[in-house]
């Protein structure tokens, strides 16, 4: 988790002087509770936006937006803590809005936004906005949280972001797999425009089961420039095991931008349809 272009962060708006600060996610009001605390945020919304860095890179960001309730507690609102928790790693990043002037009621509802948390493809986040100071122990909670899932690199809009392109999202191998005679598979795919090697990972399964009955790895050396965007054809020999008929072919590229952590593409060959076999007729008939 990180912030995009940290030096450009602003939270001031007409009628409010405000500064954005790094936060340890442990506001001082936890340790030194105040008697009077503000109410919780209203209408917290999290949206996926896309933002360019000053270097021109494009990143997915969490756009966080919320409003204030129209009650007198805004007189005691000193700021807000924004927290983003990545659920699969438990990594948390926080920033603090510090109000440098007192809020006053005005003719329209106070609204705040922040769009600088960079999020990763195919990750789920819990976004929390805590009004400050935080409540006293056993006080009413004054935060709001939302869970938010970011699409993966297969998503059309995500595909062109820098993290996705770095992991090879623009490469479409258009894999085809056909079953040949004599227990062989022909795998064909389009090479990318980079002199890098590939690996074909073959995993075979019985018809209705998910534990593998055969595994094989095939190395494809780096193509020459004249072979870029051409089709590569590989014939794989299968183990002659009856019923080991469902084959998953996965192609792993080793592009320079993602090394051994590039997006993999796969194709599956299903078992052939079995005709319904009639009950065998016994070749003798019992007489009793």
């Amino acid at each position: 988790l990180r912030l995009l272009d940290h030096r450009a962060l602003v939270c001031s708006q007409p009628g409010l002087n405000c500064t954005v600060k790094n936060s340890t996610c442990l506001d001082d009001s936890w340790i030194h509770p105040r008697n009077l605390t503000p109410s919780s945020p209203k209408d917290l919304q999290i949206q996926l936006h896309f933002a360019h860095t000053q270097q021109g890179d494009l990143f997915p960001v969490a756009h966080i937006e919320w409003t204030l309730q129209t009650d007198a507690s805004i007189l005691y609102l000193e700021g807000a803590e924004l927290s983003v928790l990545q659920l699969n790693t438990n990594e948390r990043l926080c920033v603090r809005f510090e109000f440098l002037s007192k809020l006053r009621h005005h003719h329209r509802r106070w609204r705040f936004t922040f769009s600088h948390f960079v999020v990763d493809p195919d990750q789920e986040y819990e976004v929390t906005v805590h009004h400050l100071p935080k409540p006293i122990p056993d006080g009413d909670p004054n935060h709001q949280s939302k869970n938010f899932l970011v699409p993966d690199c297969e998503h059309a809009r995500m595909k062109v972001t820098t993290p996705c392109m770095s992991s090879g999202s623009l490469w479409d191998p258009n894999i085809t797999v056909e079953t040949l005679e004599a227990h062989q598979l022909r795998v064909s795919f389009t090479l990318w425009n980079e002199s890098t090697h590939y690996q074909i990972l073959l995993t075979s399964f019985p018809h209705m089961e998910n534990h593998s009955c055969f595994e094989h790895m095939h190395h494809i050396p780096a193509p020459r420039p004249e072979e870029f965007h051409q089709r590569s054809n590989v014939t794989l020999t299968l183990r002659n095991l009856k019923g080991c008929c469902r084959h998953q072919v996965q192609i792993q590229p080793f592009f320079s931008s993602c090394l051994n952590d590039c997006l993999r593409h796969s194709a599956t060959v299903s078992c052939p349809e079995m005709p319904d076999t009639p009950e065998p007729i016994p070749d003798y008939m019992p007489l009793w």
């Epitope: 919304q45 999290i46 939302k146 938010f148 699409p151 993966d152």
Partner: nanobody
Framework: QVQLVESGGGLVRPGRSLRLSCTAS????????MHWVRQAPGKGLEWVSG????????DYADSVKGRFTISRDNANNSLYLQMNSLRSEDTALYYC????????????????????WGQGTMVTVSS
């Protein structure tokens, strides 16, 4: 223009099944997460289920978990809700909803993340 059209509602006996469909037009369907929300007669809106852009993630309200299944067919711009073991308390007007942004707001506290609603299809569960 952007449009969502629900169908498949009707009168059904308790314990039976029904499949709701929603056809989308006017936007890139496979960019967005979709949800089903319902409103029982005289009651407020209740979120029922949601699904991510590619169907990789699905969520359900506790009241329908294990009985309802959400799915989508991006090739045909369609969203579905398979409703099994229907109960009288499932009687409601069911709405198909598109999310505002490209992410997927998970769980039931997402009403402010929705922007396009269909006109609804009525499901009545009665013996």
């Amino acid at each position: 223009q952007v449009q969502l059209v629900e169908s498949g509602g009707g009168l059904v006996r308790p314990g039976r099944s029904l499949r709701l469909s929603c056809t989308a037009s006017g936007f890139t369907f496979d960019d967005y997460a979709m949800h089903w929300v319902r409103q029982a007669p005289g009651k407020g809106l209740e979120w029922v289920s949601g699904i991510s852009w590619n169907g990789g993630a699905m969520d359900y309200a506790d009241s329908v978990k294990g009985r309802f299944t959400i799915s989508r067919d991006n090739a045909n711009n369609s969203l579905y809700l398979q409703m099994n073991s229907l109960r009288s308390e499932d009687t409601a007007l069911y709405y198909c909803i598109k999310e505002k942004s490209l992410g997927y707001c998970r769980g039931g506290s997402c009403s402010d993340a929705f922007d396009i609603w269909g006109q609804g299809t009525m499901v009545t569960v009665s013996s």
